[in-house]
C-alpha cells in the first residue's frame, strides 16, 4: 500500500478484476480509501457467517488521513464465489457517491464446479421471447468447461454472438426464442466426474387482457355488512401478474386479501384477488382500485363503495303516470325510477293481482315490468310493490297503461274473392265496413271515379291512385247515395263500428273506399264498384238455330271492367281431346258503357258448321280464361210441303175471310200469294200474316173473287196450292175470265 496521491476510488489489496483461490483457504481483502467505506458481498455470503470478519474503516496511511478496512473469510467455500465490492459511504458533501472498486473471487472446488446445484428440482428461469435469457450456471473456477444441453438430446453451442459463455454469469442467450423453452442443463466434467445443474425455462409474457371487479360499481352496503370485491385479471397463457389494492382503509389494513389462479381456461390465465372487509363502517366508503402489473404492463380497475347507515326506498314514475303503447309491439317496458338499499323485494300487480301469475308474457326485470307481444288485454293499472322486510320499509306506485290499436277493417281480413263482384245496373247496393281500433277510429267514405273511354276497350281504366273525393249523403259524385250511417256493435266481445254506405242507383263504375284512422294509423279498404248491364257479367246468345244455307248469328257480351281479350272459338273433340279452333273473319268487338260485345256471323252455313261455339274472355284480375259455350246444330235442308191444301171457299160480300197456307221445310220456306196469277202485295184491306202464311181479306168486294194460289219456296224446291174464292151477292159472271 503506497500513500501517494488522493484516491478517487477505493483501492483493493488484490489487483485485477478477478482472483482464483482454492476452497478451504482464507480470503484476505483490504480496502483503502479517502473516506469511510462499506463492503458489498455475493448473495451467497451471509453477513452473519462466523467465518466472515470485516474490520470497520479506521484511520491509516500517512498522517492517518486515509481509511482502511479488512475483509477476512476463513475456510472459503465454493458458494462464496462472487463479486466483492468496496464503496465509499455516501455523505451529503461527498461527490464520490458511486465511487467503488470490485473484484470477482473464484473459490475453486473440484467437488463443486457449479456455485448453485439444482439436481433435485430444476430452477425455474423466466424468459421473454426476443429478450436476453441467462442460464445462471455460474462456476467456481474460470477454467471449468461447461456444456449447455436441452432435454432430451440437443446441445446449445455458444457461437460468440447469440449464445455466449461467461463463467461469472452463466450462458447468455442474446435474444431468446421459443426454442430455448424446456428443461436445460449445464454439464461439467471435473476429474472424470460429471456434474449437472438443471434449469426449466418458462415463457414469460406481460399481456394483461382484461381487469374487472365484481360486483360491478357502485357497490352498496349497510353498516355492519361484509364487503367482498373480486378483482379478476385475464392474461395470456404464461403471463404472471402482481395484484394489489388501493382503498380507503389501506393504511390501517382494514381488508384481508386472498389471491388465486384459475388455469381452467384453454386460452388464457385468470388471476383472482379477493378483498374482504367484515363489518363495514362509514369510513370504508370510497374508491377501491385493483392494480395489476406484469413486467412493464399495468392496468387498474376502480369501483366505488357506498356504506349506508339504514335502508331506504324512493320510487317515482320514470314516464307519465298514464302511459300508452300499441298492440302488436314485440315488447313494452313499464319502468319506475327506484332508489333503494338494500335491494327490495319487487312484486308487480296488474289490476290488483300479481302480474306474472296472470300471463307468462309478463317478465320482471329490475324495477321494470316487460310485457311481451302487447295485446289489448294488457291495458290496465300496474302497481309496483317494493319492500325491504328487515328495515320494515314498503312503498308502492301505480301507473295506468293504455293499449292503442291501429284501426282494422274486418272485411279486409276475410279472404276476398279473386275478382271483384259486379253490381247490376240500376240496383240498390249496401256497402259495409266493420272497424275496430283504440282510440275509436273515425270512418270516412271516399269515391275514386274511373275515367274510362267508351270508344275503345280499356281494361286498366280504373286505378286506385286516381284522385279521390270524400263522400257525404248529399254528394252527387258517382252514384246517388241513399245514406251513410254508423252503428256500434259488439262482435266477439269487442266494440266495433259498422259503417254502411247505401248506393241508391248503381250507374257509375269506380272505387268506393272506407278509410278508418286514429292516432296510431290509417287503414283503407277499397271496394271496386263495377256496374254491369250483362247478367253475371258474361252472356252468350244465338239468334236462331240455322238451317243449311242460312246465316249463323252469335253474340257475346262481357262486362268490360272484368274481362278483356274477347274472342270466339270452335271446340272440336278429336280422340277424346278437346281442341280449340280459332275462328277467322271475326268482327271487331264494340265497347259500350259497361260491356264489350263481339258478334259472330257465319254466312250460308253447312252441316259441317255444327258444333260447340264458345266465347272466351280473360278475367283481368285472375288472368283466367273463361268460356261460355253454346251448341249449334245446323239443320238439314228439306223441300217445302204444305200441311193442308187450299180449298174453294165462298164468302159473303162485305164479310171477311182468311186463307191459310201452312208450309214446312228446311230452311223455313218463303211463302208468296198470287190472285189470278198476280203476286199479292199487302195493301189496305189485304193483310199478310206472320211469315206470309195467312192472307186476310176484310170487307170482301166482288173484285176479290178469283183463283188464289200460295207458293212455298226454299233452296230445295217449291210447292203450291190453289182455290177459288166465290163472293156471294154479286151479279152472275163467269168464274173464269
Amino acid at each position: 500500500y503506497g500513500s501517494g496521491s488522493k484516491l478517487k476510488v477505493p483501492e483493493l489489496s488484490l489487483k485485477g478484476t478477478q482472483h482464483v483461490m482454492q476452497a478451504g483457504q482464507t480470503l484476505f481483502l483490504k480496502c483503502r480509501g479517502e473516506a469511510a467505506h462499506s463492503w458489498s458481498l455475493p448473495t451467497t455470503v451471509s453477513q452473519e457467517d462466523k467465518r466472515l470478519s470485516i474490520t470497520p474503516p479506521s484511520a491509516c496511511g500517512r498522517d492517518n488521513r486515509q481509511f482502511c478496512s479488512t475483509l477476512t473469510l476463513d475456510t472459503a467455500q465454493a458458494n462464496h464465489t462472487g463479486l466483492y465490492t468496496c464503496r465509499y459511504l455516501p455523505t451529503s458533501t461527498s461527490k464520490k457517491k458511486k465511487a467503488e472498486s470490485s473484484i470477482y473471487i473464484f473459490v475453486s472446488d473440484a467437488g463443486s464446479p457449479f456455485i448453485e446445484m439444482h439436481t433435485d428440482i430444476p430452477k425455474l428461469v423466466h424468459m421473454t421471447e426476443g429478450r436476453q435469457l441467462i442460464i445462471p450456471c455460474r462456476v467456481t473456477s474460470p477454467n471449468v468447461t461447461v456444456t449447455l444441453k436441452k432435454f432430451p438430446f440437443d446441445t446449445l453451442t455458444p457461437d460468440g454472438q447469440r449464445i455466449t459463455w461467461d463463467s461469472r454469469r452463466g450462458f447468455i442467450i442474446a435474444n431468446a426464442t421459443y426454442k430455448e423453452i424446456g428443461l436445460l442443463n449445464c454439464e461439467a466434467t471435473v476429474n472424470g466426474h460429471l456434474y449437472q445443474t438443471n434449469y426449466l425455462t418458462h415463457r414469460q409474457t406481460n399481456t394483461i387482457l382484461d381487469v374487472q371487479i365484481r360486483p360491478p360499481s357502485p357497490v352498496r352496503l349497510l353498516h355492519g355488512q361484509t364487503l367482498v370485491l373480486n378483482c379478476t385479471a385475464t392474461t395470456e397463457l404464461n403471463t404472471r401478474v402482481q395484484m394489489s389494492w388501493n382503498y380507503p382503509g389501506k393504511a390501517t389494513k382494514r381488508a384481508s386479501i386472498r389471491q388465486r389462479i384459475d388455469r381452467s381456461h384453454s386460452h388464457n390465465n385468470v388471476f383472482h384477488s379477493v378483498l374482504k372487509i367484515n363489518n363495514v363502517e362509514s369510513r370504508d366508503k370510497g374508491l377501491y382500485t385493483c392494480r395489476v402489473k406484469s413486467g412493464s404492463s399495468f392496468q387498474s380497475f376502480n369501483t366505488s363503495v357506498h356504506v349506508y347507515e339504514k335502508g331506504f326506498i324512493s320510487v317515482k314514475h320514470r314516464k307519465q303516470p298514464v302511459q300508452e303503447t300499441t298492440a302488436g309491439r314485440r315488447s313494452y317496458r313499464l319502468s319506475m325510477k327506484v332508489k333503494a338499499f338494500p335491494s327490495p323485494e319487487i312484486v308487480w300487480l296488474k289490476d290488483g293481482s300479481p302480474a306474472t301469475l296472470k300471463s307468462a308474457r309478463y317478465l320482471v326485470h329490475g324495477y321494470s315490468l316487460i310485457i311481451k307481444d302487447v295485446t289489448t288485454e294488457d291495458a290496465g293499472d300496474y302497481t309496483i310493490l317494493l319492500g325491504i322486510k328487515q328495515s320494515r320499509l314498503f312503498k308502492n306506485l301505480t301507473a295506468t297503461l293504455i293499449v292503442n290499436v291501429k284501426p282494422q277493417i274486418y272485411e279486409k281480413s276475410v279472404s276476398s274473392l279473386p275478382s271483384p263482384p259486379l253490381y247490376p245496373l240500376g240496383s240498390r247496393q249496401v256497402l259495409t265496413c266493420t272497424v275496430y281500433g283504440i282510440p275509436r277510429p273515425t270512418i270516412t267514405w271516399l269515391w275514386h271515379p274511373c275515367h274510362h273511354n267508351h270508344s275503345k276497350e280499356r281494361y286498366d281504366f280504373c286505378t286506385e291512385n286516381e284522385e279521390s273525393f270524400i263522400l257525404d249523403p248529399s254528394s252527387n259524385l258517382g252514384n246517388r247515395i241513399e245514406s251513410i250511417s254508423q252503428r256500434m256493435t259488439v262482435i266477439e266481445g269487442t266494440n266495433k263500428t259498422v259503417s254502411t254506405l247505401v248506393v241508391a242507383d248503381s250507374q257509375t263504375p269506380g272505387i268506393y273506399s272506407c278509410r278508418a284512422f286514429n292516432k296510431i294509423g290509417t287503414v283503407e279498404r277499397n271496394i271496386k264498384f263495377y256496374v254491369t248491364d250483362v247478367p253475371n257479367g258474361f252472356h252468350v246468345s244465338l239468334e236462331k238455330m240455322p238451317a243449311e244455307g242460312e246465316d249463323l248469328k252469335l253474340s257475346c257480351v262481357v262486362n268490360k271492367f272484368l274481362y278483356r281479350d274477347i274472342t270466339w272459338i270452335l271446340l272440336r273433340t278429336v280422340n277424346n281431346r278437346t281442341m280449340h279452333h280459332s275462328i277467322s273473319k271475326q268482327k271487331m268487338a264494340t265497347t259500350q258503357d259497361y260491356s264489350i260485345t263481339l258478334n259472330l256471323v257465319i254466312k250460308n252455313v253447312s252441316l259441317e258448321d255444327s258444333g260447340t261455339y264458345a266465347c272466351r274472355a280473360r278475367n283481368i284480375y285472375t288472368g283466367e280464361d273463361i268460356l261460355r259455350k253454346t251448341e249449334v246444330l245446323v239443320r238439314d235442308s228439306e223441300a217445302p210441303h204444305l200441311l193442308q191444301n187450299l180449298s174453294d171457299y165462298e164468302v159473303s160480300i162485305s164479310g171477311s175471310t182468311t186463307l191459310d197456307c201452312q208450309a214446312r221445310g228446311v230452311p223455313a220456306p218463303q211463302i208468296t200469294w198470287f190472285k189470278n196469277n198476280h203476286k199479292i202485295q199487302q195493301e189496305p184491306g189485304i193483310i199478310l200474316g206472320p211469315g206470309n202464311s195467312t192472307l186476310f181479306i176484310e170487307r170482301v168486294t166482288e173484285e176479290d173473287e178469283g183463283v188464289y194460289r200460295c207458293r212455298a219456296t226454299n233452296q230445295k224446291g217449291a210447292v203450291e196450292s190453289a182455290a177459288y174464292l166465290t163472293v156471294q151477292g154479286t151479279s152472275d159472271k163467269s168464274n173464269l175470265e
Epitope: 430444476p122 438430446f153 421459443y178 426454442k179
Partner: antibody
C-alpha cells in the same frame, strides 16, 4: 384448459399406412416437446416417439424406427404420426402427449387396428 | 420386457399406506428425473409425480415420490377406493435417447 384431440385411427391391413393427427389447444403449442405413446390392448404404456418444440430433433423407439415418422406444424397447433408398413403388433390406442415437467397432458387416444 | 421394473400388482385396504417400486439403471433413473402416471380404468393416463417427487396442482398430498440411485418409489398413504388404478413410472434414457416406462402396477383396494 389443455386439450389434445387425436384423430386418424382406424382399421388397416398389415403393410398398410395411416396418418394420426393431434390438434392442441389451451397452451402455446410451439413451446413444448411432444410425444406419441401407445398402449396395446390389455398391456402397459409404450413410448413411441418424441419431437422437440421447434421440430428440429426427433427420436423413436426401436420397435417403430424406420417405419414411423413424427412431425408437427406449429402454425396449426398440430402433431402428426405417419405410420407405414404397419404390423399386427402396432395395434393399440395411440396417445398424443405434451412434455414439460414430465408427460404433463394426455389426449383421449385414437385406436389403430392392424388386421387382415 | 420393460426397461424399468415394477411389481405387476399391489394391494391394500382403505386407509393403509402402499408403496410401489420402480427399478432402472444409471442411464435412466440414475441420471434423469422420474415421473409417475395413474391410469384409471378406461381413461387416459394422468401425470401424478414429476421431477422425482413434485406433485402437479390438483394431485392430493397422499401421493408422494422419491428417488435413490437407480430406483424410485411411489407411496400412497390413506388409501382410498378411487385410487384403484394402474400406476406407471417413466424416465428418459440418455444412453439410447428414448423414454422408458415400467411395466405398470395394478393397485387393488381391498374390502
Amino acid at each position: 384448459e389443455v386439450q389434445l384431440l387425436e384423430s386418424g385411427g382406424g382399421l388397416v391391413q398389415p403393410g398398410g399406412s395411416l396418418r394420426l393427427s393431434c390438434e392442441a389447444s389451451g397452451f402455446i403449442f410451439r413451446d413444448y416437446n411432444m410425444n406419441w405413446v401407445r398402449q396395446a390392448p390389455g398391456k402397459g404404456l409404450e413410448w413411441v416417439s418424441i419431437i422437440t418444440n421447434d421440430g428440429s430433433s426427433t427420436a423413436y423407439s426401436d420397435s417403430v424406427k424406420g417405419r414411423f415418422t413424427i412431425s408437427r406444424d406449429n402454425s396449426k397447433n398440430s402433431l402428426y404420426l405417419q405410420m407405414n408398413s404397419l404390423r399386427a403388433e402396432d395395434t393399440a390406442i395411440y396417445y398424443c402427449v405434451k412434455v414439460y415437467y414430465g408427460m404433463d397432458d394426455w389426449g383421449q387416444g385414437t385406436t389403430v387396428t392392424v388386421s387382415s | 420386457q420393460s426397461v424399468l421394473t415394477q411389481p405387476p400388482s399391489a394391494s391394500g385396504t382403505p386407509g393403509q399406506r402402499v408403496t410401489i417400486s420402480c427399478s432402472g439403471g444409471s442411464s435412466n433413473i440414475g441420471s434423469n428425473y422420474v415421473s409417475w402416471y395413474q391410469q384409471l380404468p378406461g381413461t387416459a393416463p394422468k401425470l401424478l409425480i414429476y421431477f422425482n417427487f413434485q406433485r402437479p396442482s390438483g394431485v392430493p398430498d397422499r401421493f408422494s415420490g422419491s428417488k435413490s440411485g437407480t430406483s424410485a418409489s411411489l407411496a400412497i398413504s390413506g388409501l382410498q377406493s378411487e385410487d384403484e388404478a394402474d400406476y406407471y413410472c417413466a424416465a428418459w434414457d440418455d444412453r439410447v435417447n428414448v423414454w422408458v416406462f415400467g411395466g405398470g402396477t395394478k393397485l387393488t383396494v381391498l374390502g
